[in-house]
Interface confidence: low
């Protein structure tokens, strides 16, 4: 689904696109377009990807520019004014709506701008699917800071009857020292599950700086997932894991 | 199966001391915040205290500096020493994994503070 | 100290009958709202934790839902077993804190 209306109330069904009117075409002069970007349950969020191809008058964005605003209008969190010719990073609201501005002046035009929404569940740009008997699992950037709003999976899959060794080198995350602190991990933090995520017994939730240390898993499947909030990054993980053939699987061979 | 199992609990003379044990199996303890939340007869739930997993330590009001909470990886078992105990302590203690939230409780264990 | 605040204090219904059970926290606490089932004579069984996430292996005729200060935990269809009494806890800020609880009686 493709909207090049000047302004409109998007009610996420289904990933869609908004477009400045004319994209990928000069937009026009003298435009001030409106989008309320809304989940149908208040307890979703919104992800929104930018066309790489993005092209607005650049000019300090004085004249010609694209708003984000957490929220259902301009009063919202403010998350960034954008123009020129590079794409702006993903937006995650942190509640149901995302409201966008477009500003044009009456000279000097580009392509515009295209914009993909969708309701924001896993982190596609950077869960991954591990089948290798050893590997390397690292926290997006590291060793620099991670992104904010983040919802990263991560799944071992190993042939049943073998073990998962998972060993951290670097662990760093938002700590959440503050009362209740420790106890919720509010913040950032990683999940980590022997078998799928939510599915498998939970081994544990972990932030701040004291590494998890050794994981062991036996079901053949190990999982993580790696959330941060929209604010205060660190550093990050790196960990490697390693297959263990179990003496029950040596039996079959 | 997740299961913590409270022992310790019994009848002490206001100003004596208990010790109070949770035995945990069923997952990595070392993971996991543990707390203690009590129940007085025929009353509400009342936290009582919490450990992290980094060791923080965090105490109601009312039971600041009396109750020491404490935990042993090696025994994977959780501790509530409880000093210059009061009539108005007296209840079921539960232990409880700090999960999402409190997600798993043991059975309790009953202290009467009474002379 | 955030004070969490039940209503009603108890309730009589039928089974079948759809029940609702509110809380309310004396200050914002997000969605840090958790909601627990006790029976007599046992331990409090967690049922919906980020005020609106059903613990693993709770049935789903119960559902929570509200944020900030206001919060509500409804049961569908109330069924014999869910007869007990409901707490809700914020898991905002220590000290953690507990409504003082509402008993869901057979009328």
């Known amino acids: 689904f493709r909207n090049d209306k000047c302004g409109d109330t998007i009610k996420i069904e289904s990933p869609g696109y908004l477009t400045s009117p004319g994209y990928p075409h000069s937009y026009h002069p003298s435009e001030k377009c409106e989008w309320l970007i809304q989940a149908p349950d208040p307890y979703q969020r919104i992800m929104i990807n930018f066309n790489p191809h993005f092209d607005l008058e650049d000019r300090d964005c004085k004249y010609d520019y694209v708003e984000v605003f957490d929220g259902e209008n301009e009063n919202g969190h403010f998350r960034g004014k954008f123009c020129g010719k590079i794409a702006p990073p993903p937006v995650v609201s942190s509640g149901p709506f995302l409201f966008i501005k477009f500003v044009s002046d009456y000279e000097t035009h580009g392509a515009g701008f295209s914009i993909r929404y969708e309701i924001f569940k896993r982190g596609p740009e950077c869960s991954q699917n591990y089948t290798t008997p050893s590997g390397v699992i690292k926290s997006p950037g590291f060793p620099e800071k991670y992104p904010n709003s983040l919802e990263c999976t991560y799944i071992v899959f190993v042939p049943k009857m073998s073990e998962i060794i998972l060993e951290f080198e670097s662990f760093d995350l938002e700590p959440d020292s503050n009362p209740p602190g420790g106890m919720f991990c509010r913040y950032d933090r990683l999940e980590i599950w022997d078998g799928f995520p939510d599915v498998g017994p939970h081994i544990g939730r972990y932030c701040g700086q004291k590494t998890p240390g050794r994981i062991r898993s036996s079901s053949g499947i190990l999982s993580m997932v790696f959330y941060t909030d929209s604010a205060i990054a660190k550093e990050g993980f790196s960990a490697n894991y390693s297959v263990l053939q179990s003496s029950v699987s040596e039996d079959f061979k | 199966e997740v299961q913590l199992l409270e022992s310790g609990g019994g009848l002490v003379k206001p100003g004596g001391s208990l010790r109070l044990s949770c035995a945990a199996s069923?997952?990595?303890?070392?993971?996991?915040?543990m707390s203690w939340v009590r129940q007085a007869p025929g009353k509400g739930l009342e936290w009582v205290s919490s450990i992290s997993r980094t060791g923080y330590t965090y105490y109601a009001e009312s039971v600041k500096g009396r109750f020491t909470i404490s935990r042993d990886e090696s025994k994977n078992t959780l501790y509530l020493q409880m000093n210059s105990l009061k009539t108005e302590d007296t209840a079921v203690y539960y232990c409880?994994?700090?999960?999402?939230?409190?997600?798993?409780w043991g059975q309790g264990t009953l202290v009467t503070v009474s002379s | 100290d955030i004070q969490m605040t039940q209503s009603p204090s108890s309730l009589s219904a039928s089974v079948g009958d759809r029940v609702t059970i509110t809380c309310r926290a004396s200050q914002s606490i997000s969605s840090y709202l958790n909601w627990y089932q006790q029976k007599p004579g046992k331990a409090p069984k967690l049922l919906i934790y980020a005020a609106s996430s059903l613990q693993s292996g709770v049935p789903s005729r119960f559902s929570g839902s509200g944020s900030g200060t206001d919060f509500t935990l409804t049961i569908s269809s109330l069924q014999p077993e869910d007869f007990a009494t409901y707490y809700c806890?914020?898991?905002?800020?220590?000290?953690?804190?507990f409504g003082g609880g509402t008993k869901v009686e057979i009328k």
């Open positions: 069923g997952f990595t303890f070392s993971s996991y915040a």
């Open positions: 806890q914020q898991s905002y800020s220590t000290p953690l804190t």
């Open positions: 409880a994994r700090v999960g999402t939230a409190f997600d798993y």
